[in-house]
Interface confidence: low
Amino acid sequence: MLLPWATSAPGLAWGPLVLGLFGLLAASQPQAVPPYASENQTCRDQEKEYYEPQHRICCSRCPPGTYVSAKCSRIRDTVCATCAENSYNEHWNYLTICQLCRPCDPVMGLEEIAPCTSKRKTQCRCQPGMFCAAWALECTHCELLSDCPPGTEAELKDEVGKGNNHCVPCKAGHFQNTSSPSARCQPHTRCENQGLVEAAPGTAQSDTTCKNPLEPLPPEMSGTMLMLAVLLPLAFFLLLATVFSCIWKSHPSLCRKLGSLLKRRPQGEGPNPVAGSWEPPKAHPYFPDLVQPLLPISGDVSPVSTGLPAAPVLEAGVPQQQSPLDLTREPQLEPGEQSQVAHGTNGIHVTGGSMTITGNIYIYNGPVLGGPPGPGDLPATPEPPYPIPEEGDPGPPGLSTPHQEDGKAWHLAETEHCGATPSNRGPRNQFITHD
């Protein structure tokens, strides 16, 4: 092969001598340098030589970054010239032109990772968050990766973003609570690492819920409180009905009986139970969120102002970890969540025309089960198109959570969502064109 300098003035002077030597070598040695005769139409070095059928000889190819400026003959090898700017040839070739450099097409979702050189075409890949949807030796068109729903993550392929996301469930002990093309499953929080205990196990879509360790509880207390939780609303209803009846029908005897009934304390309860030693009843099977705190699971949204009051300071001194509300989904409440509050003396006292209640009043302010939802109720999440592994049956949707009151101090239940932060954005699939 001859490079451009061979055709310059000094090169031409040496030309006849060089060609004469080539002729002698070709005649005397069958293993000579190109051009050389080939009867079987194959050349020794197929990468760097090619068969020229017109003359039945093997000639040199031009190296990468060059092209054929003059074809070979029986007495002269191929003459090569360097590719002009913005053109290239990648391989040993016998092309008479260089190929034009093409930019990466952003409309097609491609971005440049290496510029074009005389020896290599522009290197492109799919933009972050995209995958190669059209492939013809190289990627020509990228499309947006599809989201993986909560409880799943994109199975991470290697470097070539040649395929769309394949969403796989989070492995055991991990969760992912967003719809995203790149969010990765995160390990469940280990409550014990933070000096807390598990209140509700994590699922594939939500983190473990943590709470402060509770002191041992007298077994009979929870029974008493369960009675109270169920009977108090009933007692109120009866009280109101009776009062209404007293006013309406003027039955003084009935009013007197009611007064004497309300002066009694609930059976088996002493005057001063120890503050803080009481456990509220476990979730009722039909009203599972009656005693559960309304704490949202963390979502992949910014903690912008939601118009909610700030969480009150807990008496035990544990900072309340506030999670941003995910306004797109119903809060997922797990059965069995418990809370701990301080209490004074429990009892119902009616004196004269007024009624004093010391103790915990549970006010159920949710919609009537089975009834139409109110205008302020969040819609229940539609059933997702994939299975959700849950530790327990979720309660009926749409139930609000009551707060507990004791005198003038308001105490939020100390159940916490530990470490529940919006999941980190993981890698986005990327594609590199190899040539």
Epitope: Q123, L156, E159, V160, N424, R425, G426, P427, Q430
Partner: antibody, heavy 113, light 107 residues
């Protein structure tokens, strides 16, 4: 020219630690999936770990999970492999590579008492 | 994990021979397969990616074919510099896995 150069190999006792470095030139490590491979003496190639271009979740072979940590320093344009609790079977030549399939020349790690 | 089975584990051939190496995946990997060449004391070099695409600068005597689970690397006319060990590698999913290698030596 795109190049990778590993360093940090050597002789270490079982249970010991080593930190391998991979210095990149001609490209930025933050733009590519970066990988570590290894090859035990007389054996085949084995993938060890990868880290994505956006610096997201790393991936590890089961044989090194919990012991090895892949990381990178974009300011130094370098990739690292922190190897703890080393075992005899970790003895190998360790190569770093990028997703354009540029490989380093390798660095030898020998775990022996 | 996806297992990659390469055969033969070694072969002897002469310059100019046509050489074929096969690689089988334990499950469908589409076309996410690479072929590497490694010479003693050197790092591997990529020959083929995406099962059949020739890496830039690699001689055209190397070619790859196959899709799904069965793949082939062919050297159309073996050259002296081709005596080396060849590995296939799947990159369909993590963990990335290699075949056991095929050593090509001089007959």
């Amino acid at each position: 020219e795109v190049q990778l150069l590993e360093s940090g190999g050597g002789l270490v006792q079982p249970g010991g630690s080593l930190r391998l470095s991979c210095a990149a030139s001609g490209f930025t490590v933050s733009s590519y999936v970066m990988k570590w491979f290894r090859q035990a003496p007389g054996k085949g190639l084995e993938w060890v770990s990868s880290i994505s271009g956006s610096g997201g979740r790393p991936f590890y072979a089961d044989s090194v999970k919990g012991r090895f940590t892949i990381s990178r320093d974009n300011s130094k344009n370098a990739l690292y492999l922190q190897m703890n609790s080393l075992r005899a079977e970790d003895t190998a030549v360790y190569y770093c590579a990028n997703d354009m399939d540029v490989w380093g020349q390798g660095t030898t790690v020998t775990v022996s008492s | 994990d996806i297992q990659m089975t390469q055969s033969p584990s070694s072969l002897s051939a002469s310059v100019g021979d046509r050489v074929t190496i096969t690689c089988r995946a334990s499950q469908d990997i589409s076309s996410f397969l690479k072929w590497y060449q490694q010479k003693p004391g050197k790092a591997p070099t990529l020959l083929i990616y995406a099962a059949s695409a020739l890496q830039s600068g690699v001689p055209s005597r190397f070619s790859g074919s196959g899709s799904g689970t069965d793949f082939t690397l062919t050297i159309s006319s073996l050259q002296p510099e081709d005596f080396a060990t060849y590995y296939c590698q799947q990159y369909n999913t993590y963990p990335l896995t290699f075949g056991g290698g095929t050593k090509v030596d001089i007959k």
